[in-house]
């Protein structure tokens, strides 16, 4: 097919010879609304931001990638000729760095369903260079770890030696999805969840007098666990009053989230406060209702065979504790009116 109508994008991959690195190309159709094919999805053209990775059809795997040989030979199907390059949906993954990856890569929809689709293609001219200057000794790694449950950050390797003030506007992607609000060379993650694990791509534009190109780096982010620094968090009950019917049985559930600890001795118990007295209630055993790498949610119920007038004067207190500290949540019973 004729590639002269394809939009063109120039990219630069500067790889470190010291570390293993990956690289990605998105089938990045810059103005989807110009092509009939490029917005055949659930979003209306007005809702598709420019420079989104290819979102052309409901099935993103129906994209074909080619490489254009430098000697002018016909386009080659990537999947057949390049074992170190993997196509995942609309993204092309380069598993190993090297100048031999330099070249022109073309993507377009597999299914041409209308005459307009012919021009729905992108040509990416990729230049790959080894990093030469060691001017930035502490540049960010292409593999970065985030400690689950804490605040962390993800730095763009190609810009990590620049201050935020000097840094150009950066475009970030996570697992191929544009993170439109992240624009600096460092993403601050307020609280790290396992969701934050993935492949991040940072792009910025570099120009000279002749042309401009996109400098791209890929960061593999892994989320790791450290011992919690937080006391447990009571998820339920949230309200401090509970409407009840006198004479009826009642179960009050206490659910608490305990952060990961290598030596884990969670405490979850109910006690009752009545004027100056307080006593622990023997209630059914606590049970774990959800366990993840980062935390565990434990539930313990208090069961009243029937609610009495006396219970309305009492406070039912859920007490939870780990090695960091404790949290309580009290519940006052209130008679249901009407």
């Amino acid at each position: 097919f004729n590639i002269s109508g394809c939009s063109t994008k120039k990219l630069l991959w500067t790889y470190s010879t010291r570390s293993e690195e990956e690289f990605v190309l998105f089938c990045d159709l810059p103005e989807p609304q110009k092509s009939h094919f490029c917005h055949r999805n659930r979003l209306s053209p007005k809702q598709v931001p420019e420079h989104l990775p290819f979102m052309g059809s409901n099935d993103l795997s129906d994209v074909q990638w080619y490489q254009q040989p430098s000697n002018g030979d016909p386009l080659e199907d990537i999947r057949k000729s390049y074992p170190h390059i993997i196509q995942d949906k609309c993204t092309l993954h380069f598993l190993t760095p090297g100048v031999n990856n330099s070249g022109s890569y073309i993507c377009r929809p597999k299914m041409i369903k209308s005459p307009y689709d012919v021009a729905c293609c992108v040509k990416m001219i990729l230049e790959v260079k080894p990093q030469t200057n060691a001017s930035c000794e502490y540049s960010a790694s292409h593999k970065q770890d985030l400690l689950l449950g804490s605040t962390g950050s993800i730095s763009c390797p190609s810009l990590s030696c620049q201050s935020d003030a000097q840094s150009p506007a950066v475009t970030w992607y996570k697992n191929g999805k544009l993170l439109s609000v992240e624009r600096s060379n460092r993403i601050v993650v307020d609280e790290v969840y396992d969701y934050h694990q993935g492949t991040y791509v940072c792009d910025y534009t570099q120009s000279d007098t002749v042309s401009s190109w996109t400098v791209r780096a890929v960061v593999q982010v892994r989320t790791i666990v450290g011992d919690t620094k937080l006391k447990p968090d009571i998820l339920d009950p949230v309200e401090d009053t509970l409407e009840v019917e006198l004479g009826k049985p009642l179960t009050i559930s206490c659910k608490a989230r305990f952060g990961f600890e290598r030596v884990f001795n969670p405490v979850i118990k109910w006690y009752i406060k009545d004027s100056d007295l307080e006593w622990e209630v023997s209630v059914p055993e606590a049970k774990s209702i959800k366990s993840t790498l980062k935390d565990e949610i434990i539930e313990r119920n208090i069961i009243l065979e029937k609610v009495t007038q006396r219970d309305l004067r009492r406070k039912f207190v859920c007490f939870v504790q780990n090695s960091i500290g404790n949290t309580t949540q009290s519940v006052q019973l209130k008679e249901k009116r009407g």
């Epitope: 605040t151 992240e182 934050h196 937080l230 968090d233 949230v238 935390d295």
Partner: antibody, heavy 119, light 111 residues
Framework: SLEESGGVLVKPGASLTLTCTAS?????????ICWVRQAPGKGLEWIAC????????TYYASWAKGRFTISKTSSTTVTLQMTSLTAADTATYFC?????????????WGPGTLVTVSS | DVVMTQTPASVSEPVGGTVSINCQAS??????LAWYQQKPGQPPKLLIY???NLASGVSSRFKGSGSGTEYTLTISDLECDDAATYYC?????????????FGGGTEVVVK
């Protein structure tokens, strides 16, 4: 509980600082504290949030950037500074705190404080 | 900012009926969505978080569903007390889970 204060009648062009005070709780690290406003008879409009943890990250609605500033001034107070006020800023201003493991939702709200901008 | 489009603006149903309120996000918000109920003169009350999780103390007549860009709040067996304005709210901002943009609201009238 949460309580907003500082809502008064001001003239267009004036500045105003609203305060959100927590009692019985503190703005501990796992929470976002946010300001939301509601013009008379209109819908809820998100203004800004601050993360109470170590990052102290702040987040603003695009229309609020530059004119509104959210700050955590102590473990129990968060403020919203507003400048160049216009009649369009007349609203009840609520502060809200995130909940449990779903920090991106707010289950604890103040009753609101009314700001009136009029000459 | 994400744009949250809520429909319908108003709906009227008899007691015992069912109401569905839709919320469309301008981009994939990955189920970081909450629903609130607000009555005149009161702050909003959280009903649903994470698109489908019922907040503590909320009646199971309220059901949240959806993913990606399309979300729905369904209220079944309508009661007079359900008359209120309902709002959806997006809860993701870049890589952080931050309460942010609201939908325009839906007024539910119970006949």
């Amino acid at each position: 509980s949460l309580e907003e204060s500082g809502g008064v009648l001001v003239k267009p062009g004036a500045s105003l600082t609203l305060t959100c005070t927590a009692s019985g709780i503190d703005f501990s690290s796992s929470y976002y504290i946010c300001w939301v406003r509601q013009a008379p008879g209109k819908g809820l409009e998100w203004i800004a949030c601050i993360y109470a943890g170590s990052s102290g990250s702040t987040y603003y609605a695009s229309w609020a950037k530059g004119r509104f500033t959210i700050s955590k001034t102590s473990s129990t107070t968060v403020t919203l500074q507003m400048t160049s006020l216009t009649a369009a800023d007349t609203a009840t201003y609520f502060c809200a705190r995130g909940t449990g493991s779903s920090h991106y939702t707010s289950n604890l709200w103040g009753p609101g404080t009314l700001v009136t901008v009029s000459s | 900012d994400v744009v949250m489009t809520q429909t319908p603006a108003s709906v009227s149903e008899p007691v015992g009926g069912t109401v569905s309120i839709n919320c469309q996000a301008s981009e994939d918000i990955e189920s970081y969505l909450a629903w609130y109920q607000q009555k005149p003169g009161q702050p909003p009350k959280l009903l649903i978080y994470g698109a489908s999780n019922l907040a503590s103390g909320v009646s199971s007549r309220f059901k949240g569903s959806g993913s990606g860009t399309e979300y729905t709040l369904t209220i079944s067996d309508l009661e007079c007390d359900d008359a209120a304005t309902y709002y959806c709210q997006c809860g993701i901002y870049g890589v952080n889970f931050v309460p942010n943009v609201f939908g325009g609201g839906t007024e539910v009238v119970v006949k």
